[in-house]
């Protein structure tokens, strides 16, 4: 039975040209995380972190995506096109699969604040 919940950073905003941390956290389960997939709104994969193989960053994002902190992802050199939904998919053992959603808004304004409050989607 799947008892866990995915907490995410929810809706966040960051400055164009800046960086942002995408973070999900699996709680309320003893399940082991075997793999975490990070993908964009159009289903394209950004990065994968496998418990036994480590990180794999997709070639198209190699210059702008850094693994971590933890199972999270750091997106750098943000452009307006980075605005949209991001998803973390947690493959766990023995529970199964959990999925979380983050919405990132990239702002032109220099007053953009990066909010990183954890939310349960």
């Amino acid at each position: 039975m799947m008892t866990g919940t995915i907490e995410t950073t929810g809706n966040i905003s960051a400055k164009k040209g800046g960086s942002v941390i995408l973070q999900c956290h699996l709680s309320s389960t003893m399940a082991q995380v075997t793999q975490v997939n990070w993908e964009q709104h159009d289903h394209s994969l950004l990065a994968i972190r496998n418990a036994e193989l480590g990180w794999h960053i997709y070639p198209a994002f190699k210059d702008r995506v850094a693994p971590g902190p933890g199972l999270g992802l750091t997106l750098q050199s943000l452009t307006m096109n980075d605005t949209g939904e991001y998803f973390c998919t947690y493959h766990t053992y023995p529970d199964g699969t959990y999925r979380g959603r983050i919405f990132l808004e990239v702002l032109e304004s220099s007053v953009a604040e990066h909010s990183a409050r954890f939310q349960i989607p």
Epitope: E39, H43, L45, A51, E52, L53, H91, Y93, T97, R99
Partner: antibody, heavy 119, light 107 residues
């Protein structure tokens, strides 16, 4: 060249046991997840078991859970499937397959070994 | 358990035609799907993984797509070597179920 060679298939009576082996070569076995898939006489493909690269995680469908055990010996580059309490519906060609890194699709398959469960 | 409904079960087509095979998942599997080809007397071979990624060495006339929970394999300008059986397989919730298969025959 990647090679997967299955062995151990046989004719066995219902309730019996059998152990299949799959010898792997041509790649770094210890860094790949591996699976067993069977093809029934009516040509349907059925996933049987999966084991992670290090052997820490094993997965089974309900149809074989508790009866079949997948294991691996990374020092010997060999994958195993221990089958017990065999039923007539387990009759099939059994393939071992390598999984794509970071994905679960199977990119290399062996030629298969035949298992017949009949009295 | 997630069910994969593959259609059609069989298809009779001519060389040069374009064919689309579909698999519908009973719930969202978020692109965790592969397509395989199997020729008579041979082992299956992967064509597409992660719904849209062409496996190494697979001709560009093959393509995978997704619309919601429906996944499609399209083969443009069928060649004689493309005839055989095709299967989809999902990878979600620690289960890896196959579709029922599609047999592609020469008309």
């Amino acid at each position: 060249e990647v090679q997967l060679v299955e062995s151990g298939g046989d004719l066995v009576k219902p309730g019996g046991s059998l152990k299949l082996s799959c010898a792997a070569s041509g790649f770094t076995f210890s860094t790949y997840g591996m699976s067993w898939v069977r093809q029934t006489p009516d040509k349907r493909l059925e996933w049987v078991a999966t084991i992670s690269s290090g052997g820490s995680y094993t997965y089974y469908p309900d149809s074989v859970k508790g009866r079949f055990t997948i294991s691996r010996d990374n020092a010997k580059n060999t994958l195993y499937l221990q089958m017990s309490s065999l039923k007539s519906e387990d009759t099939a060609m059994y393939y071992c397959a390598r999984q794509v890194h970071y994905f679960y699709a199977m990119d290399y398959w062996g030629q298969g070994t035949s298992v017949t469960v009949s009295s | 358990d997630i069910q994969m409904t593959q259609s059609p079960a069989s298809l009779s087509v001519s060389v040069g035609e374009t064919v689309t095979i579909t698999c519908r998942a009973s719930e969202n599997i978020y692109s965790n799907l592969a397509w395989y080809q199997q020729k008579q007397g041979k082992s299956p071979q992967v064509l597409v993984y992660a719904a849209t990624n062409l496996a190494d060495g697979v001709p560009s006339r093959f393509s995978g797509s997704r619309s919601g929970t429906q996944y499609s394999l399209k083969i443009n300008s069928l060649q004689s070597e493309d005839f055989g059986s095709y299967y989809c397989q999902h990878f979600w919730d620690n289960a890896y179920t196959f579709g029922g298969g599609t047999k592609l025959e020469i008309k």
